[in-house]
């Protein structure tokens, strides 16, 4: 290891995992246990992360790189790094203060994260909707009525007594 | 999971050099510290130095300087130690350790070192 | 040098009994960074030395929770509760706060 890069500052001599010691002559000492830097030339080592509670370790910390955490079963990361747990909801749920709640009428939820979104409006592209939409899934839409005149599709058209979009609860 | 294994019993003469090596599994080999231990019956435990191995860089006890030199491997994963101008005085365990959350987290098995004529 | 005096050199018990050790340092042990690098560690006989307190109280995983640690600036304690035949060999303290890291002498646990 190369200890005379610098003639000015001895301490951008010491690389990532170590510190620049000023009580023992700034020679590059370790990070101590639970504690990295992920560059050189430090004065200090950061503290590592502690992926406790909700949180479970992904990557453990080294002398070199911080942990990670991702979160335990039945919560999903939310921020950058993975900084909350948020609790996962059912398919056709979303969060909300006071816990997971069906989706609305007209809205779908196909993950364990995130909010209900409004199915699909198919008449606004000029289509029919094949699948009829649920809490879990989204509207299908199919061609435009006018694509379905006789003889032109093998596609059966849904029942003309429900609206687009309805969904049996 | 985190594993140290060390190089088998060596029988030296004096004034001899040994090279004890310390083969990691299981992490990141370049990215912890690897520490360095004697173990003397009546003498206890004494720490010798440690090396990052992705930088080469090492810290040494004053008690060692001149005595052990440190090396390693990154593409074997293995951390090497020598001991040089041996004398009656090295015969002992010697060990391997990775810092983690206490300075010595993970272990090798230890190397025995016979310095007799 | 800090010198890290343990206390007994020998300590027989009763299995079952509680168990408690002394580890002086010859002076205060924080590190820099605000950190006590107090350690204890095991040493069965013919094995490797393995880790059981690391920063004067916290136990190491797989460590039965009958392990405990305390102390502070230079006075610290390892208690085992209830003492198993497992747990019998040399425990060994361990300051690295300040270089060179240094080990107390050891205490024996034995059967009385």
């Known amino acids: 290891f190369e200890r005379t890069r610098s003639l000015q500052d001895p301490c951008s001599n010491c690389p990532a995992g170590t510190f620049c010691d000023n009580n023992r002559n700034q020679i590059c000492s370790p990070c101590p246990p639970n504690s990295f830097s992920s560059a050189g030339g430090q004065r200090t080592c950061d503290i590592c992360r502690q992926c406790k509670g909700v949180f479970r370790t992904r990557k453990e910390c080294s002398s070199t790189s911080n942990a990670e955490c991702d979160c335990t079963p039945g919560f999903h990361c939310l921020g950058a790094g993975c900084s909350m747990c948020e609790q996962d909801c059912k398919q056709g749920q979303e969060l909300t203060k006071k816990g997971c709640k069906d989706c609305c009428f007209g809205t779908f939820n196909d993950q364990k994260r995130g909010i209900c979104r409004p199915w699909t409006n198919c008449s606004l592209d000029g289509k029919s909707v094949l699948v009829n939409g649920t809490k879990e899934r989204d509207v299908v839409c199919g061609p435009s009525p006018a694509d379905l005149s006789p003889g032109a599709s093998s596609v059966t058209p849904p029942a003309p007594a429900r609206e687009p979009g309805h969904s049996p609860q | 999971q985190v594993q140290l294994q060390q190089s088998g019993a060596e029988l030296m003469k004096p004034g001899a050099s040994v090279k004890i090596s310390c083969k990691a599994t299981g992490y990141t080999f370049s990215s912890y510290w690897l520490e360095w231990i004697k173990q003397r019956p009546g003498h206890g435990l004494e720490w010798i130095g440690e090396?990052?191995?992705?930088?080469?860089?090492?810290n040494y006890n004053e008690k060692f300087k001149g005595k052990a030199t440190f090396t390693a491997n990154t593409s074997s994963n293995t951390a090497y130690m020598q001991l040089s101008s041996l004398t009656s005085e090295d015969s002992a365990v010697y060990y391997c350790a990775r810092l983690g959350l206490a300075w010595f987290a993970y272990w090798g098995q230890g190397t025995l070192v016979t310095v007799s004529a | 040098d800090v010198l890290m005096t343990q206390t007994p050199l020998s300590l027989p018990v009763s299995l079952g009994d509680q168990a408690s050790i002394s580890c002086r340092s010859s002076q205060n042990i924080v590190h820099g960074n605000g950190n006590t690098y107090l350690e204890w560690y095991l040493q069965k006989p013919g094995q490797s030395p393995k880790l059981l307190i690391y920063?004067?109280?916290n136990r190491f995983s797989g460590v039965p929770d009958r392990f405990s640690g305390s102390g502070s600036g230079t006075d610290f304690t390892l208690k085992i509760s209830r003492v198993e035949a497992e747990d019998l060999g040399v425990y060994y303290c361990f300051q690295g706060s300040h270089v060179p890291r240094t080990f107390g002498g050891g205490t024996k646990l034995e059967i009385k």
């Open positions: 090396i990052l191995p992705g930088s080469g860089v090492s």
């Open positions: 920063q004067v109280s």
